[in-house]
Amino acid sequence: DSSKWVFEHPETLYAWEGACVWIPCTYRALDGDLESFILFHNPEYNKNTSKFDGTRLYESTKDGKVPSEQKRVQFLGDKNKNCTLSIHPVHLNDSGQLGLRMESKTEKWMERIHLNVSERPFPPHIQLPPEIQESQEVTLTCLLNFSCYGYPIQLQWLLEGVPMRQAAVTSTSLTIKSVFTRSELKFSPQWSHHGKIVTCQLQDADGKFLSNDTVQLNVKHTPKLEIKVTPSDAIVREGDSVTMTCEVSSSNPEYTTVSWLKDGTSLKKQNTFTLNLREVTKDQSGKYCCQVSNDVGPGRSEEVFLQVQYAPEPSTVQILHSPAVEGSQVEFLCMSLANPLPTNYTWYHNGKEMQGRTEEKVHIPKILPWHAGTYSCVAENILGTGQRGPGAELDVQYPPKKVTTVIQNPMPIREGDTVTLSCNYNSSNPSVTRYEWKPHGAWEEPSLGVLKIQNVGWDNTTIACAACNSWCSWASPVALNVQYAPRDVRVRKIKPLSEIHSGNSVSLQCDFSSSHPKEVQFFWEKNGRLLGKESQLNFDSISPEDAGSYSCWVNNSIGQTASKAWTLEVLYAPRRLRVSMSPGDQVMEGKSATLTCESDANPPVSHYTWFDWNNQSLPYHSQKLRLEPVKVQHSGAYWCQGTNSVGKGRSPLSTLTVYYSPETIGRR
């Protein structure tokens, strides 16, 4: 309605004597700013005067404030939006209706707010969820319809009069919609909290009690049980009787069914609070408990461990591990059902008692072949001695022992012979299945453990064999001691260390890598001609004519071997130089004359130099000197010089004669 002023505030506010009240309030006037404000207590409209009568708690006009109870009552608003009020302290007789008389330039309005002030602090209100179950977290809420800035309060939670350990979250609201103080407590109740009293206590700032609210907890929980057994230690012998009783200490709601469990499995036809076991057997040993159910679920008692004692049963032996490898460790375990556990053991190896072995386990750190056989044991406890079981078999495996390689041939062996060898051994577990030979070769094995080497090589020095089961055992190598003709015969230059120059002293050595037998003879030859019978061939002063192809031979009682041909190269400076002329030493002028420098040199000539009859050098560096066109004045003696890495050589003079052409003679 556009003709109304618009106000927002809580409908009713609550407080108690001596506290305070804070009234959150907003408004919107019909026109303009607020010019006058009066706070009435229980206002009555007077029709005669057309004004409101009642106690004026606060007044403010454009002319200034009227000092009534100005200090106790405060207008905290403004001229256009806020109409918040505070009364501090508040009294019992403040209860009733507050009237906010508002006037603007042209409009007036009376807004009513209810105030409920009690004589004493009123109690807060505890809110509980509809159902509480053990161990499920719930939130307890304590609500008080009061909050005021000038009067701080606190809400505290108590369980059976004792402050609760859990941290509560307190919140306040002072808004135009609501005014309250609230405390929320998160809490996981246990079955033992059932029926306990929870209190929310209102306190002032100093912790002084103001009021409270209480509730009794109704915690739904499964039945809580206690089990009793006769005899109390639950240890009996076969044939004895046992009684177990189940007592319910608490259940909410009431229980509905009872049952008994052994090792987690339900016992049939046992639905009373007492379980009677007559003439028990060892099979009845185990963990017993009773189970009682209600609408929340089943509850179980603690377990009672019933032990039915008996003498050891026939024993078995477990071996870790069989078959065992020689040198490894092995553990034997004597297994026998008994209660109480056996206190003493007797061990047997192949029927014979093993001295000093009285434990459940026997450990052998390093197994040897003789440890193989049958192992059995006997267990003993306070009720008697068990029987010896069938025992377990230990198989000890090991590589072949005492392996040897044997040569079957008569000695000595010569290169090219056929050699037969056998591989022998003393014992093996498991059996030998194959043989290996070192070194490897394309050899034949005519039967298991026999090797045949056709055309034995000079370098077949030693042979070893291995006999193999799961492992291979190698024999020591045997020497074949093969005899052969000298090998790798070659010619080696001993001196000079560098290249051979004409005039040098030269020594050649006839080398070979090996010979068996060692006694040898030497022969040197060049072009099929025998030169000497020593290991060395010596030249005091080598000449170019000594160059050529040399071979040496070495022989022993088995045969003889020749070296590859070795080329002896003699380096020498250019020699036997001469100048040849083409087409001849007499040439007609105008034609072409070619002079060639011929020589014998090792290495070949690398540089040529040409000279005329006055020893003047001509600008040519090659073997041929070409004069074209040749002139009469070119007639004369020419010579050449050849150079290689060893030295220089020069030719004698060769004369070129250039004669006049018929044309020149004709012109004269």
């Epitope: 540089h607 130099t609 005329d612 600008p619 560096h621 090659s622 041929k624 002139k631």
Partner: antibody
Framework: EVQLQQSGPGLVKPSQTLSLTCAIS??????????WNWIRQSPSRGLEWLGR?????????DYASSVRGRVSINVDTSKNQYSLQLNAVTPEDTGVYYC?????????????????WGQGTMVTV | QSALTQPASVSGSPGQSITISCTGT?????????VSWYQQHPGKAPKLMIY???NRPSGVSNRFSGSKSGNTASLTISGLQAEDEADYYC????????????FGTGTKVTVL
């Protein structure tokens, strides 16, 4: 300092004779450790050695086979100069012509390089 | 007699090193140690830079060096400078019956 100064016409008609002269200063045409060369350069043939003359106990000359028969190198010892004559020229003989010295000894060892060049003459046929 | 073979062009940035190759036969480059190298700027006569494979005439910078392997000679210019931009020719004595000297095809060096 050795210098070579070239002279001669820059334009020659086809079939005529091309004549160029190279005057030597700072060295002698009679030197027995030098040769005196003619080299030409054209875009189509690059640098091309044509011939040389030199004096030892007498005068010698060598020519490239590409011009042999129509080339001659002459010496005027009195003027310390040498010249190139190329007969029966064709447009293929167009190019820059250089005279150059080849010094054949570098101390005691043999050498061979064109160490001094003339300024070059552009000849158009 | 065909000319000695050189790459048509080689380029490099200032301060870099470049190498020019010159390939002949056993009758020229491979047979004699008389290989020389010439620098030619546009409109100018060639200038001798290296003679007898690896010798430098006085006045030529030591940034220029020469070498030979088999039938191939090489000119290396290290610490390239702007003034090195020019044409470069190799030359060799030859035992050919048609010539006494043979020149290379020439290489244009560009400084980037």
């Amino acid at each position: 300092e050795v210098q070579l100064q070239q002279s001669g016409p820059g334009l020659v008609k086809p079939s005529q004779t091309l004549s160029l002269t190279c005057a030597i200063s700072g060295d002698s045409v009679l030197s027995n450790s030098d040769t005196w060369n003619w080299i030409r350069q054209s875009p189509s043939r690059g640098l091309e050695w044509l011939g040389r003359t030199y004096h030892r106990s007498t005068w010698y000359d060598d020519y490239a086979s590409s011009v042999r028969g129509r080339v001659s190198i002459n010496v005027d010892t009195s003027k310390n100069q040498y010249s190139l004559q190329l007969n029966a020229v064709t447009p293929e003989d167009t190019g820059v012509y250089y005279c150059a010295r080849d010094r054949l000894q570098d101390g005691n060892s043999w050498s061979d390089a064109f160490d001094v060049w003339g300024q070059g003459t552009m000849v158009t046929v | 007699q065909s000319a000695l073979t050189q790459p048509a062009s080689v380029s490099g940035s200032p301060g870099q090193s470049i190498t020019i190759s010159c390939t002949g036969t056993s009758s020229d480059v491979g047979g004699y140690n008389y290989v020389s190298w010439y620098q030619q700027h546009p409109g100018k006569a060639p200038k001798l830079m290296i003679y007898d494979v690896s010798n430098r005439p006085s006045g030529v910078s030591n940034r220029f060096s020469g070498s030979k392997s088999g039938n191939t000679a090489s000119l290396t210019i290290s610490g390239l400078q702007a003034e090195d931009e020019a044409d470069y020719y190799c030359s060799s004595y030859t035992s050919s019956s048609t010539l006494v000297y043979v020149f290379g095809t020439g290489t244009k060096v560009t400084v980037l």
